[in-house]
């Protein structure tokens, strides 16, 4: 957020940029949380996303029986490992086709026991407030599909007639990790020392990180003719003085007519 300054007073302004603002020769360049000519004002809303997509990672182990383990498979840069990776990836792409959240697989380790394949199944979905349910459902379908294929594609008389065959009992799901998106936490962090006063409100399923100084939300503070300003002690109304009135009170809702006050003073004297 920037405010441009013209004229002789600019040099003074330069040394007075507040709250970590930096002078660029024309204006104070303010950090995310501040704005104003001197970066003296606290913003009333902070952009917290959300991210476009949310990811999940399932740690799985399957046992491939149609390939015999060789030492070369331990080396991830060997031709053998690369070929195994290619075939395994193709096989898993077939297994998980039909799962829109499926992105791919990543082999982490191959070890002896026919070939025990430790790998991650990667899932991704567009962010909606229901992303957890979407990814939970996808992980269940992954479990169903891998269980089915490792039960059906098995060796018969030491020969496999499929791209890969598996040991039915060698399939395990070790761990499921979903990227956590917590708008409340993000809001609190980004608001820094003002974190106690910023809240998340939703509009059209999108989270907004706002202080009570942001108008149009249920938490918005009504300062009437005054101006809402954030300080370390919370939002406060700065009341205005017009030609005819002084305003006061917590929400600047108490107006005192100047003429009455002056009239009273004249009467006093």
């Amino acid at each position: 957020r920037t405010t441009t300054c013209f004229g002789d007073g600019c040099q003074n302004t330069a040394s007075r940029c507040k709250n970590g603002g930096t002078w660029d020769g024309l204006k104070c360049q303010c950090p995310n949380l501040y704005y104003g000519e001197l970066c003296e004002e606290v913003v009333s809303s902070i952009d917290i996303g959300p991210p476009e997509t949310i990811s999940a990672q399932m740690e799985l182990t399957v046992t491939v029986t149609s390939v015999k383990f060789t030492e070369e498979l331990k080396n991830h840069s060997s031709q053998e490992f690369q070929e195994f990776k290619q075939t395994f990836t193709e096989q898993m792409n077939i297994v998980y086709s039909g799962i829109p959240e499926y992105v791919g697989v990543n082999i982490t380790k191959l070890r002896l026991g026919s070939v025990v394949v430790e790998h991650d199944v990667l899932l991704r979905t567009k962010y909606t407030p229901e992303y957890k349910t979407v990814l939970d459902n996808a992980t269940e379908v992954v479990k169903e599909k891998i269980t089915k294929v490792t039960t059906q594609q098995i060796m018969i008389n030491d020969i496999c007639s499929d791209m890969m065959c598996f040991n039915t009992t060698g399939t395990q799901v070790q761990n499921i990790t979903v990227t956590q998106y917590d708008p409340e936490e993000d809001c609190r962090k980004m608001a820094k020392e003002y974190g106690d006063y910023f809240v998340v409100e939703y509009r059209d399923q999108k989270p907004y990180c706002i202080s009570p100084c942001e108008p149009g939300f249920s938490v918005s503070k009504n300062c009437n003719l005054g101006k809402c300003q954030m300080s370390l002690s919370g939002p406060q109304c700065l009341c205005v003085t017009t030609e005819t009135h002084w305003y006061s009170g917590e929400t600047c809702n108490q107006g005192t007519q100047k003429s009455l006050v002056y009239g009273h003073h004249h009467h006093h004297h």
Epitope: T70, E83, F84, S161
Partner: nanobody, 123 residues
């Protein structure tokens, strides 16, 4: 880069014999799996036989006792000796290879392929 070149096909009478060869270049001859597949007109490609680096062999039921697969690691070559040929053996024969020790007759498991050689069994 692995390259496979199949040869030895031709026209033969029922009951006759043929020997197919496959020359492999860029393939580590003492490792992996080499195989023969065939595709008859209008049919899917099917596994005929494969041989592993340790000499372990496997055959399709339809060719057991008639066909013999072998490999010469020194020459980086694969062979298929076909005896007692039948009309139903008529097909294009392909050699295939994998760097892995495979136990599968599924074509999708083999990344390296030679061009086919035609075998016709007819009187």
């Amino acid at each position: 880069d692995v390259q496979l070149q199949a040869s030895g096909g031709g026209l033969v009478q029922p009951g006759g014999s043929l020997r197919l060869s496959c020359a492999a270049s860029g393939f580590p001859s003492s490792r992996g799996t080499m195989a023969w597949f065939r595709q008859a007109p209008g049919k899917e490609r099917e596994g005929v036989a494969f041989i592993n680096s340790d000499g372990r062999t496997s055959y399709a039921e339809s060719v057991k006792g008639r066909f013999t697969i072998s490999r010469d690691n020194a020459l980086s070559s694969l062979y298929l000796q076909m005896n007692s040929l039948r009309a139903e053996d008529t097909a294009v024969y392909y050699c295939a290879a994998s760097l892995l020790y495979l136990m599968t007759v599924n074509a999708a498991a083999y990344p390296y392929w030679g061009q086919g050689t035609m075998v016709t069994v007819s009187s």
